[in-house]
């Protein structure tokens, strides 16, 4: 015979073809062997011009030989070489599918590999590729979009060889709150790291607000609206500044009275105050907290104290906000001017968390009267809020 070729090569099969001998022959003897693969010999009819090779090893170079027989006579042997394809990984599955994450798992191919190419694509056409190591059989996908169909494909690699791709389809879970209106909803969406988040006032995507979320204190879900920690920010600011907010939300800042009004108008909120000073800590929680609108001069409502810091905010309940340029307190003097800060002053304060950082003069510093009195400026203070029913929402999410 002549013209021995192989076609339709896969990871486990190939088709051998040849030109028949000119003379009539009784049979053809076919043998094939590969590295670490014992030789297999088959005899086929002399009328045959092709033979299907099966049960081959993947990613293996084979040597194929064929000769003709007629009675006791044997023709010369012709030879061809071919390499089987790299077999694909198996059983690609998406598990632990969440709104923004999923876990891909697979079984390795029979052949040894040098790595895997993972490709995942969303319906909107966003494609991401990643190459992982040869010993990997799972990969965590992150930063996925909620409520989105994905096609994930995997291909085994061995040097220049690439297997066929296998695929799986999955859909990420929809966010519980696509436009979270506060940090509690961001947390219930699965975000559990403290840091900067975008919330949407009243769930309106046009009303985006960047906030710092405390996701650790007492279960998390808190919008931080005041932080004092180092004295770098000037808190002796005017009415306009306190209405709008100022500072760096990762550092010292005030979120703004207009924002506080809009947030607390969304429902029933609770207030938490965390205080730290020279290794000591204290906190106060008020289960009812709201800030009125500009017409009320951002009137404070704060009720239902519990905690370790002492109930210093009760004195300020029902008061309007005061700054040095808008005196709404009940004192003859201007409290904000006298104590170089701003607050819901009365005459004047038991709480002065926007006072002068590090100033231990009477009533001038960062004060929480029932914890450290008026002659000690507290080193660290945060005021934060979350829905009063957060515990119920959290429980419902865990059960779900």
């Amino acid at each position: 015979p002549s013209g021995l070729v192989t076609a339709n090569i896969t990871d486990s099969e190939a088709l051998a073809r040849w030109q028949p001998a000119i003379a009539t022959v009784d049979s053809y003897v076919i043998s094939y062997t590969g590295e670490k693969v014992p030789e297999i010999t088959r005899t086929v009819s002399g009328n045959t011009v092709e033979y299907a090779l099966t049960d081959l090893e993947p990613a293996t170079e084979y040597t194929l030989r064929i000769f003709a027989e007629k009675g006791p006579q044997k023709s010369s042997t012709i030879t061809a070489k071919f390499t089987t394809d790299l077999d694909s990984p198996r059983d690609l599955t998406a598990t632990e599918v969440q709104s923004e994450t999923a876990l891909l798992t697979w079984r390795p191919p029979r052949a040894s590999v040098t790595g895997y190419l993972l490709v995942y694509e969303s319906v909107d056409g966003t494609v991401k590729e990643v190459i992982v190591g040869p010993d990997t059989t799972s990969y965590s996908l992150a930063d996925l979009s909620p409520s989105t169909h994905y096609t994930a494909k995997i291909q085994a690699l061995n040097g220049p060889l690439r297997s066929n791709m296998i695929q799986t389809i999955f859909t990420t879970i929809g966010l519980l709150y696509p436009f979270p209106k506060d940090c509690s909803q961001a947390m219930l969406n699965g975000d559990t790291t403290s840091g900067l988040y975008t919330i949407y006032l009243n769930g309106d995507k046009a009303e985006a607000l960047e906030v710092f979320c405390d996701m650790t204190s007492d279960g998390g879900g808190w919008i931080v609206f005041l932080r004092r920690k180092n004295g770098r920010e000037n808190f002796y600011q005017n009415w306009k500044a306190y209405a709008a907010g100022f500072g760096d939300r990762r550092e010292e800042f005030w979120l703004g009275l207009d924002n506080l009004n809009k947030i607390t108008a969304q429902g029933q909120y609770e207030l938490r105050v965390d205080l730290r000073d020279h290794g000591e800590t204290a906190f106060a929680v008020y289960d009812k907290f709201s800030v009125g609108d500009a017409k009320t001069r951002y009137k404070l409502k704060v009720e239902g104290y519990s905690g370790t810091a002492g109930d210093s905010m009760a004195y300020h309940n029902g008061r309007s906000f005061s700054t040095f340029d808008k005196d709404t307190d009940s004192a003859i003097t201007n409290c904000a001017l006298s104590y170089k800060g701003a607050f819901w002053y009365r005459n004047c304060h038991r709480v002065n968390l926007m006072g002068r950082y590090g100033d231990n003069n009477h009533s001038q510093g960062v004060n929480w009267f029932h914890w450290k009195g008026h002659e000690h400026s507290i080193q660290f203070a945060e005021m934060k809020l979350r829905p009063s029913n957060f515990r119920n929402l959290e429980g419902r999410r865990k059960r779900a």
Epitope: E303, Y305, D311, Y315, N317, N347
Partner: antibody, heavy 120, light 107 residues
Framework: QVQLVESGGGLVQPGRSLRLSCAAS????????MHWVRQAPGKGLEWVSG????????YYADSVKGRFTISRDNAKNSLYLQMNSLRAEDTALYYC?????????????WGQGTMVTVSS | DIQMTQSPASLPTPVGDRVTITCRAS??????LNWYQQKPGKAPKLLIY???NLETGVPSRFSGSGSGTDFTLTISSLQPEDFATYYC?????????FGQGTKVDIK
């Protein structure tokens, strides 16, 4: 209208006990801290004890600490002062008083008082 | 404890005159100062809170001023119904303490 009415006063021997009550009406009782203030015959006003709206925090003058106990029953809109080991110097007219807002604040509503006389 | 010192102890005054009572705290108390009026056989009545705020229903002839440690109660024109004993009280810290009282009587 907002009203406080004290009761439970009387004549008692030194070393004995007495329990004063104050019935509140006309306001949301558990929203406010409450206090007892006394006035010895012909003398000035002396703060005795205070209690937070929830009843979780209590405060006492040094002169009564360890002998008097303030308490409240918000379901009954009632304030109490349990007075043990009474002394002659505890003789006074005892007033219950409501604060304006916080624990340490002006007393905007007072009862008419109940007289306690400690004498053998 | 914060001591409150009132003066004078007694103030005989004719009807129509201006009355000034002072109260001094032994330490700085911001504006945590209240004034009460007490008539014989009656409970005290709040007149002024937070040093200068007139309680609802109290006549405008009463006024309060001061901050820190020194405070004043003023009756601009004494009326017959104003003859009583007046007490200042600090609500800055527990124990809340009262002044010893100033008796305003008819001259």
């Amino acid at each position: 209208q907002v009203q406080l009415v004290e009761s439970g006063g009387g004549l008692v021997q030194p070393g004995r006990s007495l329990r004063l009550s104050c019935a509140a009406s006309g306001f949301t009782f558990d929203d406010y801290a409450m206090h007892w203030v006394r006035q010895a015959p012909g003398k000035g006003l002396e703060w005795v004890s205070g209690i937070s709206g929830s009843g979780g925090s209590t405060y006492y003058a040094d002169s009564v600490k360890g002998r008097f106990t303030i308490s409240r029953d918000n379901a009954k809109n009632s304030l109490y002062l349990q007075m043990n080991s009474l002394r002659a110097e505890d003789t006074a007219l005892y007033y219950c008083a409501k604060v304006m807002s916080s624990m340490e604040d002006a007393f905007d509503i007072w009862g008419q008082g109940t007289m306690v006389t400690v004498s053998s | 404890d914060i001591q409150m010192t009132q003066s004078p102890a007694s103030l005989p005054t004719p009807v129509g005159d201006r009355v000034t009572i002072t109260c001094r705290a032994s330490q700085y108390i911001q504006g945590f100062l209240n004034w009460y009026q007490q008539k014989p056989g009656k409970a005290p009545k709040l007149l002024i809170y937070d040093a200068s705020n007139l309680e609802t229903g109290v006549p405008s002839r009463f006024s309060g001023s001061g901050s820190g440690t020194d405070f004043t109660l003023t009756i601009s024109s004494l009326q017959p119904e104003d003859f009583a004993t007046y007490y200042c009280q600090q609500s800055y810290s527990t124990p809340q303490t009262f002044g010893q009282g100033t008796k305003v009587d008819i001259k």
